[in-house]
């Protein structure tokens, strides 16, 4: 099931997926002056079985100089419902994230691809936020958002990362200092937290993700 909305926008922060759930689509976008090859794939699709996941289809771009247009390729109408845009970055998957069963790694770049990637995320997808350069997180640890299905509707949990100005860039998971805790709310020392938001507290009574008060139960 595709997620109905984009991941939340957090002031002075960007998000990135560390691994992509099966069913995720990545539009085959080309940079200005190039177009998708004739009969080329519209998108790459993360598919797989119980032991291995990979991207089906390959994106290919060719020069559009011979055609009377430099228009950038956009998704077909049926694809335009979900446009998840992330800036192109070098893959930063921690091993435990990228090797998750049922997940694909960041697809390698293709020649003349667009500067931004447009993903169509599925329920269960997790993205991580970091403060942009010049800003620093008030709290320590990764800020996450997960696409969930609730009452028949999809929604992204709210990370509420607070990035304050004139500070150095914070880090993505995998580059964290040891013992990092989720962004935003004080977390119980005995609990395991998947998604967090500022203004939330998890108490020590919360021993599992499903019984986490404030955080998991109400997102």
């Amino acid at each position: 099931e595709l997620c109905d909305d984009d991941p939340p926008e957090i002031p002075h922060a960007t998000f990135k997926a560390m691994a992509y759930k099966e069913g995720t689509m990545l539009n085959c976008e080309c940079k200005r002056g190039f177009r998708r090859i004739k009969s080329g794939s519209l998108y790459m699709l993360c598919t797989g079985n119980s032991s291995h996941s990979s991207w089906d289809n390959q994106c290919q771009c060719t020069s559009s100089a011979t055609r009377n247009t430099t228009k950038q390729v956009t998704p077909q109408p049926e694809e335009q419902k979900e446009r998840k845009t992330t800036e192109m970055q070098s893959p930063m998957q921690p091993v435990d994230q990228a090797s998750l069963p049922g997940h694909c790694r960041e697809p390698p770049p293709w020649e003349n691809e667009a500067t931004e990637r447009i993903y169509h995320f599925v329920v269960g997808q997790m993205v991580y936020y970091q403060c942009v350069q010049g800003y620093r997180a008030l709290h320590r640890g990764p800020a996450e958002s997960v696409c969930k299905m609730t009452h028949g509707k999809t929604r992204w949990t709210q990370p509420q990362l607070i990035c304050t100005g004139e500070m150095e860039t914070s880090q993505f998971p995998g580059e964290e200092k040891p013992q990092a805790s989720p962004e935003g709310r004080p977390e119980s020392e005995t609990s395991c937290l998947v998604t967090t938001t500022d203004f939330q507290i998890q108490t020590e009574m919360a021993a599992t993700m499903e019984t986490s008060i404030f955080t998991t139960e109400y997102q």
């Epitope: 008030l138 304050t164 709310r185 004080p186 020392e189 020590e204």
Partner: antibody, heavy 114, light 111 residues
């Protein structure tokens, strides 16, 4: 259970000093930004100061800048507020708050009067 | 003067629905920061009532709901009860202050 317990309040003369403490338990104190928020008698909430999880940066409300200093000792799970050059208008209940902020202590009363 | 603007008072009879507004600016609510609501009963510390615009912490009845649009937000209380009589504050991070800002508070009276 998450707990924040303030102490150090009391009666002080104008121009005097006080140091408030906030003992935290029940969560990973060293991972979260902490705040001081105050409430004058019969008035609303006013944010005073914030300190980042590692103490590397601090911000203050204009009304206390240059007079108050926020600090923390992560090894003791304790937040502090050093208040100097106190004025009558600083009279309030001072709350320690965790997050941005969601969980609050019960507060400690600071009275500045001659 | 508070950075976020709330009506000083609101009232309703038991069972009624009451709405409290909160207006901010481009440096707080309008900048994309979430709005949070607190309930403060007489003589007690503020308690988180709504977080991230419309989420309820565990134990908060679904009679309480929140919403946000542009530079404003609102708290709605349906099925008003006598125990809802309290002061209500909105809050949001403000990037010009690098700290949270609060509304002046709304005193809710249940008639």
């Amino acid at each position: 259970e998450v707990q924040l317990l303030e102490s150090g309040g009391g009666l002080v003369q104008p121009g005097g000093s006080l140091r408030l403490s906030c003992a935290a338990s029940g969560f990973t104190f060293s991972s979260y930004g902490m705040h001081w928020v105050r409430q004058a008698p019969g008035k609303g909430l006013e944010w005073v100061s914030v300190i980042s999880y590692d103490g590397s940066y601090k911000y203050y409300a204009d009304s206390v800048k240059g007079r108050f200093t926020i600090s923390r000792d992560n090894s003791k799970n304790t937040l502090y507020l050093q208040m100097n050059s106190l004025r009558a208008e600083d009279t309030a209940v001072y709350y320690c708050a965790a997050g941005v902020p969601d969980y609050w202590g019960q507060g400690t009363l600071v009275t500045v009067s001659s | 003067q508070s950075v976020l603007t709330q009506p000083p008072s609101a009232s309703g009879t038991p069972g009624q629905r009451v709405t409290i507004s909160c207006t901010g600016s481009s440096s707080n609510i309008g900048a994309g920061y979430d709005v949070h609501w607190y309930q403060q009963l007489p003589g007690t510390a503020p308690k988180l009532l709504i977080y991230s615009n419309n989420e309820r912490p565990s134990g908060v009845p679904d009679r309480f709901s929140g919403s946000k649009s542009g530079t404003s937000a609102s708290l709605a209380i349906s099925g008003l009860r006598s125990e809802d009589e309290a002061d209500y504050y909105c809050a949001a991070w403000d990037e010009s202050l690098n700290g949270p800002v609060f509304g002046g508070g709304t005193k809710l009276t249940v008639l």
